[in-house]
């Protein structure tokens, strides 16, 4: 049997199942009550000389079979309507051990928040039980196979299923998804919708115009041969109840990225510049790597560009091997699978002063015995502009004698090219080295010059100096 929704109101208006008189008043129990049926005295009359039947375990095998009465098999209705259905069963008096009726849906027991009532109609021969089930404002999730269960004399009895079919507008289980595609390259979109009622037919829509004249059965796969510009696709799902439209999805055409929107100079040293950048629009394709272009800003230079490639993330790169105290122009571009972005606007950055690259020259050391000091002289090294402005010198002097070692250093201002240091230890060797200092740091130390300090009389002087290089251009 199949009940359409127009007949639903008659489901409970006919005569009650079995043999119950119409005027017989039932008593009801909510579905949650799983108690034994009421005892025989309740609502039943037995002649005084007739005992209620005593059923033994042996006799139970001879009892007539008990089954749920035949009921409606299929209910079809629209979403948001109300539905009621029932199970009924007649239990003869010969059955003593009877549990309450439970409702099940698709193999799982329905507990709690479901509206069900069990009604009992006792008479001389036994009891008729009706389990009523109602659902207010049905949803698709209420679709399924409902049935009743009860235990009679420890045997489980199951009703025939009542299949509830909730019909409505098509319901999407797979909608098209936004994708980023290469220009003029084919791609697929998928749309799947279900009823009931079936069948569900699909129309595809591109930029508000239907793509297919004839509908396709769901599921439908649309193959787009290629696009040259962004488009919006959606699908329409039709069934007997009406039409549902999917979300519109943007299909973007992959393009080259936009150049970075910001570049930051985070730090500069004498030979490196740390840059970071903020990537521009990625062109609907992930950035793969970035290129930092560097050229000397000095107009006199030949304009050759150094290129440093790095991964797209993190957006940070330390440009190294740069000249000290130099001005650079820097630009950044990034690439995705389509190609390179335009370069960012060129920005300016400078390296700081470097440390001197040459040691002081012509170092000589004399012992002034009368004053007990060492007299040290040198000539200024050829410091290049990028080495920065000379601020002074560091003199390292190491004193060694039997069992004694002393390492000391002095700093002198840039004005002088000589210094005096007191003798620290007699009967010792003193090793002197000198380095030039600029704001950029300390330069290399000169080759060591040794002098032997006698006990207190004669001096054995080992004159030593560093030869001036042939080229001292600055």
């Amino acid at each position: 049997e199949k009940w359409e929704e127009t007949e639903l109101d008659q489901l409970f208006s006919g005569p009650l199942p079995g043999r119950l008189p119409v005027n017989h008043r039932p008593f009801s129990a909510p579905h949650s009550s799983r108690d034994q049926l009421p005892p025989p005295q309740t609502g039943r009359s037995h002649p005084a000389h007739t005992a209620a039947p005593q059923v033994t375990s042996t006799a139970s095998k001879l009892l007539p079979p008990v089954a749920f009465n035949h009921t409606i098999g299929h209910i079809v209705l629209s979403e948001h309507k109300n539905v009621k259905f029932n199970c009924s069963i007649n239990i003869p008096n010969t059955y003593q051990e009877t549990a309450g009726i439970s409702w099940w849906k698709d193999g799982k027991e329905l507990l709690g928040a479901h509206h069900s009532i069990t009604q009992f109609y006792p008479d001389e021969e036994g009891v008729s039980i009706i389990a009523l089930f109602s659902i207010a404002s049905v949803q698709r999730s209420d679709n399924g196979s409902y049935f009743c269960k009860m235990k009679v004399n420890n045997r489980e009895i199951v009703s025939d299923p009542i299949y509830v079919e909730v019909q409505g507008l098509p319901y999407f289980i797979k909608q098209p998804e936004s994708v980023n595609v290469t220009r003029n390259t084919a791609f697929n979109l998928t749309c799947q919708a279900v009823g009931p009622p079936e069948p569900v037919n699909i129309f595809w829509v591109q930029n508000s115009s239907r793509v297919n004249e004839k509908p396709e059965r769901s599921p439908s796969v649309l193959t787009v041969p290629g696009l040259t510009e962004t488009a919006v696709f959606s699908c329409e799902a039709h069934n007997d109840k009406g039409l549902t439209v999917s979300k519109g999805v943007h299909i973007n055409i992959k393009v080259i990225p936009s150049p970075p929107t910001e570049v930051h100079i985070l730090n500069s040293t004498a030979h490196s510049i740390l840059v970071s950048w903020v990537p521009g629009f990625d062109g609907y394709s992930p950035l793969q790597n970035c290129s930092i272009q560097v050229k000397e800003a000095d107009r006199l230079s030949n304009g050759s560009v150094m290129v440093f490639n790095t991964s797209a993330s993190p957006h940070l790169y330390e440009i190294q091997q740069l000249q000290a105290l130099a001005n650079y122009s820097i630009a950044v571009s990034c690439r995705n699978e389509i190609g390179w972005s335009a370069v960012s606007p060129w920005i300016l950055a400078s390296t700081t002063e470097g440390a001197p690259s040459v040691a002081p020259l012509n170092i000589t050391v004399f012992l002034n015995e009368s004053n007990n000091i060492l007299d040290i002289r040198w000539t200024k090294p050829p410091i290049k502009r990028q080495d920065g402005e000379l601020v002074g010198y560091r003199i390292s002097h190491v004193w060694e004698s039997a069992g004694t070692y002393k390492e000391l250093s002095e700093e002198v201002s840039q004005n002088g090219s000589w210094a005096q240091i007191p003798v620290q230890i007699h009967n010792a060797t003193c090793t002197v080295r000198i380095a030039a200092i600029t704001k950029g740091g300390i330069g290399p130390f000169s080759e060591p010059v040794n002098i032997i300090i006698p006990e207190h009389s004669k001096v054995d002087y080992a004159p030593s100096s560093t030869p001036a290089p042939g080229n001292t251009d600055s």
């Epitope: 970075p260 929107t261 570049v263 930051h264 100079i265 903020v278 300016l348």
Partner: antibody, heavy 125, light 111 residues
Framework: QSVEESGGRLVTPGTPLTLTCTVS????????MSWVRQAPGKGLEWIGI?????STYSASWAKGRFTISKTSTTMDLKITSPTTEDTATYFC??????????????????????WGQGTLVTVSS | AAVLTQTPSPVSAAVGGTVSISCQSS????????LSWYQQKPGQPPKLLIY???DLASGVPSRFEGSGSGTEFTLTISDLECDDAATYYC???????????FGGGTEVVVK
């Protein structure tokens, strides 16, 4: 892509006022934004900028008079204590490119490539 | 703070003619070329015309031409159309300074 200002109204001198710039079609996490104003019948006057990371830089005349902040989709300009001289149309604009010098705490705008229609602020007692 | 001075104002020419607007900076513009030109019509926001002193912004017709470097810049509009009637502003940034300076504006009248 668009930017739109809101919040402009008539206020009395000294009453703080916050203007909001709402962007669509691009992200404030990828673009610096700037505020520019124009007094009636006068020229354009740059107020300040907020970088994609949230660092702010203001015109020397505007320091202390304005506060710039942002959320993921909006940028605000707070006029802390308006005077009659602050009567103007306030524009927000996207910064097409910006260079920042973190060690020296300044940055330079390359261009302002997308402007809103502006919102009028009138300061009068 | 640096100052951008625009001359002359106003400037007028007939339809089909050419006008040139000068923008002079009190000190060198950042990177010598970070100067932009904006067009503003009455009741509208400014619109970017030119950046990097000479590069046309997207959608700007080639009748607009920018030139110059360092401290001296010029905007030239040729084949004037009625729609070009507007006020034009130069603007730029400077090393060591966050200020973005606008020129005073030059009104172009098309006869």
């Amino acid at each position: 892509q668009s930017v739109e200002e809101s919040g402009g109204r008539l206020v009395t001198p000294g009453t703080p006022l916050t203007l909001t710039c709402t962007v669509s079609g691009f992200s404030l996490s990828s673009n610096a934004m700037s505020w520019v104003r124009q007094a009636p019948g006068k020229g354009l006057e740059w107020i300040g900028i907020i970088s994609s990371s949230g660092s702010t830089y203001s015109a020397s005349w505007a320091k202390g008079r304005f506060t710039i902040s942002k959320t993921s989709t909006t940028m605000d300009l707070k006029i802390t204590s308006p005077t009659t001289e602050d009567t103007a149309t306030y524009f927000c604009a996207r910064v097409g490119f910006f260079v920042g010098y973190g060690a020296y705490d300044y940055g330079i705008i390359h261009r302002l490539d997308l402007w809103g229609q502006g919102t009028l602020v009138t300061v009068s007692s | 703070a640096a100052v951008l001075t625009q001359t002359p104002s106003p400037v007028s020419a007939a339809v089909g003619g050419t006008v040139s607007i000068s923008c002079q900076s009190s000190k060198s513009i950042y990177n010598n070329n970070w100067l932009s030109w904006y067009q503003q019509k009455p009741g509208q926001p400014p619109k970017l015309l030119i950046y990097d002193a000479s590069d046309l912004a997207s959608g700007v017709p080639s009748r607009f031409e920018g030139s110059g470097s360092g401290t001296e810049f010029t905007l030239t509009i040729s084949d004037l159309e009625c729609d070009d009637a507007a006020t034009y502003y130069c603007a730029g940034g400077y090393s060591g300074d966050s200020d973005y300076a606008f020129g005073g504006g030059t009104e172009v009248v098309v006869k």
